[in-house]
Structure formats: C-alpha cells, structure tokens
Interface confidence: medium
Amino acid sequence: QDCSAQCQCAAEAAPHCPAGVSLVLDGCGCCRVCAKQLGELCTERDPCDPHKGLFCDFGSPANRKIGVCTAKDGAPCVFGGSVYRSGESFQSSCKYQCTCLDGAVGCVPLCSMDVRLPSPDCPFPRRVKLPGKCCEEWVCDEPKDRTAVGPALAAYRLEDTFGPDPTMMRANCLVQTTEWSACSKTCGMGISTRVTNDNTFCRLEKQSRLCMVRPCEADLEENIKKGKKCIRTPKIAKPVKFELSGCTSVKTYRAKFCGVCTDGRCCTPHRTTTLPVEFKCPDGEIMKKNMMFIKTCACHYNCPGDNDIFESLYYRKMYGDMAHHHHHH
C-alpha cells in the first residue's frame, strides 16, 4: 500500500485504460496506472484522475490508507430541469433554499418550521396560507368549530443550538437525508453515497459507505432454475471475508448479494442497512469503514450503464437505513 517498498509494476507495458480514463503515474512515482474515477476507492498507489479535478479523500486521520475519489469542484446537480454546479445555492421555490453538493441537492426551509403550543389566549393554533404570502402563518381559531380567523400570531420558536449537546433543538432545520445512491460498482467493492443535513448546525454533509452488490467472481447465471429468468437473492454457501485494497475484514460475514437475470433486467439492492466493518491491513493497521449490507434485492428494467456513478445518483436509489448518530453522553 505505501511507497516504502521497491517499485514493482504489475506489467511491463502500460495498461490500456477505458475511454475517458487517464493513464497516470502512481502516487509513488513507480508505475503507470489507470486513474481511479469519481466514487472509486483510491490509495497512495492508486491515485484519482487529476485531469477531472479528483482527489483522494481519506476521511478521518485513522483511515489514511484508503480513500474515495472525490471531485474538488464536485459533480453538478440536475434539479427541476436545471443544472447547478456543486456548491451553488438556488431557491427552488419561495419556501426552500437549496444547495447542490457533489451531485445531490439538499434544501433548508425559508419559512419558519416553528411550533405553536395551545395557550389560554390561543387555545386552537392553526397554520394557514394567507393570500399574497408564501409562508403559512399561525392563526388562532375560536373553539366550538367557529372558523373566524384572528390575526397571525408570533409562534413559539425553537431554541438555537450553540454547543455539542446533540439533543438540543435545531432552529428552522428541515432535516433531510437523501437515499443512498446505488453502488458505484455492479460487482466487487464499490462506494455508495448520500447527503444529509442531520447534524448540529443543519449543514449539508456527504456520507459514504462501502458496498458490494455481488462478488465479481460468482457465476450466478448457472444457479437460475429452468423456466426462470432471474435469481433475485442467491444463497451464499459460506461466510465470506471482505477484501479492500489488500486489507481483509477481521470478521467473516454471511452477507446477502443480489442475483442476475437472463432477460435484460438487472437486480439491485432494495432494502439495505449500514454497519461498521473492521479491516486488518498487512502492516497490522486496523481500519473501520461503514459498509452496506443487503436485506432485499429487486429486479427491474431500469438499468443504467455499468459502474456509472453519475447515472446512479439520478436513477437508482436505495431504500435503507437512516443515519445513526452516536454521542458520548
């Protein structure tokens, strides 16, 4: 993994890279390799494509071995028929201010998300759309079904968050978490990403996890029963250890994978969960990475191009677990 060893290249001749993929010198200055693309795993030896403005994002300092190729400028977003650059903010309507971040859009409300509790002077608070106003406003209904609308009242405002207590209420934050994107690889280890603002200051952040839809070496078509065209979730005979750039998972996992079809359909994860997996590297270092585990798969005709992470952001979404935040309290 590191550059301390002597240069040893896999082949004498330079590799042949797919169209659009740069041939670059590895990070150790040893061998010419095909540059890793957006969303792919990268190491010191396997650099990201510099001609596309990609860099290897190692995340926390504990994971300095393996990173994910991330766009410096970020992937653009398509939203409401318009294209927005990563980092660009726009108003999707009078109610929402949105930001594009690495191909995903997150929005925060411009209208107050406050709560009004019943009180003696306003026993029946109700939000109504007033003519000429974008945001709904609080009004006080009279009891006994009388619908005379009083003046709009100032509403109870959630307290702002100023410190590390994760249980503090957040002011004016519509918590949004996108579904996990489809795995960047149709077989073998890939990356799945999502964007969330479920954090202390309602800021958009990108999260990533490892994923494996199916092993590349498995010949799954053999297992399709006669008269059937698909095998949705093939049985895995024995527990497996995951490999990640020369590092191996500490535990074995009886993981579910998605099958294949012979009629042009593709099978992709439908319900997933995210669990931490520890990998042990040859030098003894232990890395912890979040990884997708498949609960159910679905077979469908909505099949984007293989390993196209951009398309996967737009077409195939996974229904999975929401973010789990652990805190020291």
């Epitope: 307290e159 702002d160 968050t161 100023f162 410190g163 590390p164 207590d165 249980t167 503090m168 209420m169 202390t200 200051f201 020291h328 309290h329």
Partner: antibody, heavy 114, light 110 residues
Framework: EVTLKESGPVLVKPTETLTLTCTVS????????VHWIRQPPGKGLEWLGV???????DYNAAFMSRLTISKDTSKSQVVFTMTNMDPVDTATYYC????????WGQGTTVTVSS | ETVVTQEPSFSVSPGGTVTLTCRSS?????????ANWVQQTPGQAFRGLIG???NRAPGVPDRFSGSILGNKAALTITGAQADDESDYYC?????????FGGGTKLTVLG
Amino acid sequence: EVTLKESGPVLVKPTETLTLTCTVSGFSLSTFGVHWIRQPPGKGLEWLGVIWRRGGTDYNAAFMSRLTISKDTSKSQVVFTMTNMDPVDTATYYCARDGGFDYWGQGTTVTVSS
Amino acid sequence: ETVVTQEPSFSVSPGGTVTLTCRSSIGAVTTSNYANWVQQTPGQAFRGLIGGTSNRAPGVPDRFSGSILGNKAALTITGAQADDESDYYCALWYSTHYVFGGGTKLTVLG
C-alpha cells in the same frame, strides 16, 4: 425572562462537601442543559461540568472523582456537589445555561477555610 | 493538559474594529470545538455572546460576530462602544469537556 440563581453555603471547612443549588426560571431543564463554572479571586474561568437536557453529564477530568451534578426538572433545580473541599477551591461558583453560555447566575462566593 | 490561549489585553478606539482570538494547544480550532465567547462586564456580570463558533446569543447586537480565522476561533467587534470595555473569555469543547481561555481585557480608548 430567563434567570439562574445559585444558592448554598458561603463558608465550607476543608474536607467537607460543598452542595450548591441552581434554580432556573424562564426555561425548562428538559430543553436546556446547565453548566457549572468557577472563578477563583482575581483569576479566569474554570469549567467544572454540565448536566445536559436529557440528564447525561460531563465533567472536567480534574474534578471527576469529586463532582456530581444532578437535577430535578419538576423543581427547575440543578444540584452541584463537590466533595473533599480544599482552600484552593475558594472561588465564585456560577451556573450558566447551555446554548452558548448565554445566561448566567449572579454567582455565589464560597470560601474554604478552617 | 489542553490549554486555550487568548491575548491578555487589547485596546480599540471608539467606533473601531477589534478581533480577539482563541488558540488551542492541540491543533487547529474547528467547528467541532463549538467556540463560545463570554463577556464579563466590570460589574462582574457574565453574558454569552457567541456559541457554536458563530451563532449570536439572544439579544446580542450584530456588532459581535464569531468565526474561525486560520487555526483560531475569533470574536470580532465592529463599531466598538465604551460599554464594550470588559473581559472576554472563549471556551472550546473537546469531545467531553470545555476548556476556558485565560481571557482578554478589552480597553476602549478615550
């Protein structure tokens, strides 16, 4: 109006236990945490600990073995207990609301002397 | 032991701008340190000005702003007034505890 008020003994003997109460109004202890901070005479501030709105606590490691913070939400009171008091613990003790330490009590001066 | 360092004293002319800083001994200050700024007036009363790096506490005028400048937390006071003459303390959060800086005594000249 948000207010916090510390109460407790003014004089404590060495090795004794100090118990201070912070009574709050204008907000609920289920909505905000409360910090305890002290200021020795002529010196700066020292953070002692916090009880969060959900009841969890964090303490300054230097005082961990001597310090307990608890609360009675229904009474709007936070109780601060420090054991084995020493003359170096002489200071003005404050409670402050979590959320940027935005509101503070007026402080209570505690002298540790025999 | 983590030490949080502030300028011991600072002076500013009325109407001027001053930036007080807060340095951590164990590396750059980030938003995860939730930098807080507290004012202690000559009458010994305390009030919070800024929490969570840049969020003003209720009732604090917008002359006060918080940010991260380089590797330090910063409190900027624009249009300084005579009653801004006070001691200013920063507090940084380190995963399980806060640490206060030694404080800066701000003098408004004139």
